[in-house]
Interface confidence: low
């Protein structure tokens, strides 16, 4: 029985060359996480593997950095980086437990002005 | 672009031998979990087994876990599927498939198959 | 291991129509269900992952819904290309179980 429940950062923004962090929180269990993937869609932007560590898909290397904690920072962002965003934490033994973000990136100029968006 | 390209089916008969293997292409070998997965003609899809990706570590479905065995070679880029004391019943169209990156053992979703090859036939008749 | 019943195992329907297809598991897998997509004589296709999450390049007419044991594939209006077999796989829990596929055919 799957009792666990994903927090996440949920819709947020961003202005255009800045930074973000993602953010997600797995609490109401007690299944060991043993990885958490970072996906775009279903492209692997980064993985914290309880025994191997960080790692950094080769094409986002200079964009994402770990962290903080089992979060992800993105960096230097362009407009092509708004989309959804995915935390998939590995559980045992419940298995997989999946986090949803959308970002959505913002010309400068209109992230000043304060602009929110929302999802149909 | 990921390719996932089987080899080695064929028609063989009741009590032999055959190995299949899967050369990969457009990915980091090294870096993937794989699967195996056939579908008879008529039947429902049946996962047959995966290999971690340093090769280290297996699992099988039950029912085929004695007779079939999968290896991998990196540094061929390539997956094997060994099947030893074949049956009529083994007769289908086999699969090669990519997981997701270096997901532990404990992980089910490694094997969750997010790309597949074209798949060989095995025939299994005297 | 973790019973799939995949239903209905075929249907007929109409370019434009709305189409649901269901999966139930004899167990609780939480979201680790996968749908995918398969047209003769190719390989099968990933539709969706996680239950609910699009996978990439995938039309939006496509959906996932569901966790626990029901879950659910909704092509919201159907164009020629969908008409093709659908299959449901759990990976919650080894051995790894697939539906018996939904033939979805022209009307």
């Known amino acids: 029985m799957m009792t666990g429940t994903i927090e996440t950062t949920g819709n947020i923004s961003a202005e255009k060359g800045g930074s973000i962090i993602l953010q997600c929180h797995l609490s109401s269990t007690t299944a060991q996480v043993t990885q958490v993937n970072w996906e775009q869609q279903d492209q692997l932007l980064a993985i914290c593997n309880a025994d191997l560590g960080w790692h950094i898909s080769p094409s986002f290397k200079d964009r994402v950095a770990p962290g903080p904690g089992l979060g992800l920072t993105l960096q230097s962002l362009t407009v092509n980086d708004t989309g959804e965003y995915f935390c998939i934490y590995h559980t045992y033994p419940d298995g997989t437990y999946t986090g949803r973000i959308f970002l959505e990136v913002l010309e400068s100029s209109v992230a000043e002005h304060g602009a929110r968006f929302q999802i149909p | 672009e990921v390719q996932l390209v089987e080899s080695g089916g064929g028609l063989v008969q009741p009590g032999g031998s055959l190995r299949l293997s899967c050369a990969a292409s457009?990915?980091?070998?090294?870096?993937?979990?794989m699967s195996w997965v056939r579908q008879a003609p008529g039947k429902c899809m049946e996962w047959i087994g995966n290999?971690?990706?340093?090769?280290?570590?297996?699992n099988y479905a039950p029912s085929l876990k004695n007779r079939f065995t999968i290896s991998r070679d990196n540094a061929k880029n390539s997956l094997y599927l060994q099947m030893n004391s074949l049956r009529a019943e083994d007769t289908a169209t086999y699969y090669c498939?990519?997981?997701?990156?270096?997901?532990?053992?404990?992980?089910?979703?490694?094997?969750?198959?997010?790309?597949w090859g074209q798949g060989t036939m095995v025939t299994v008749s005297s | 291991d973790i019973q799939m019943t995949q239903s209905p195992s075929s249907l007929s329907a109409s370019v434009g129509d709305r189409v649901t297809i269901t999966c139930r598991t004899s167990?609780?897998?939480?979201?680790?269900l996968r749908w995918f997509q398969q047209k003769p004589g190719k390989a099968p296709k990933l539709l969706i992952h996680?239950?609910?999450n699009l996978a990439n390049g995938v039309p939006s007419r496509f959906s996932g819904s569901g966790s626990g044991t029901d879950f659910t594939l909704t092509i919201s209006s159907l164009q020629p290309e969908d008409f093709a077999t659908y299959y449901c796989?759990?990976?919650?829990?080894?051995?790894?179980?697939f539906g018996c596929g939904t033939k979805l055919e022209i009307k």
């Open positions: 498939t990519r997981g997701h990156f270096r997901i532990t053992m404990a992980s089910m979703g490694a094997s969750a198959s997010v790309y």
């Open positions: 457009g990915f980091t070998f090294s870096d993937h979990w």
């Open positions: 290999i971690q990706y340093d090769g280290s570590y297996t």
């Open positions: 167990q609780d897998i939480g979201n680790s």
């Open positions: 996680g239950a609910t």
């Open positions: 796989l759990q990976h919650n829990e080894y051995p790894l179980t």
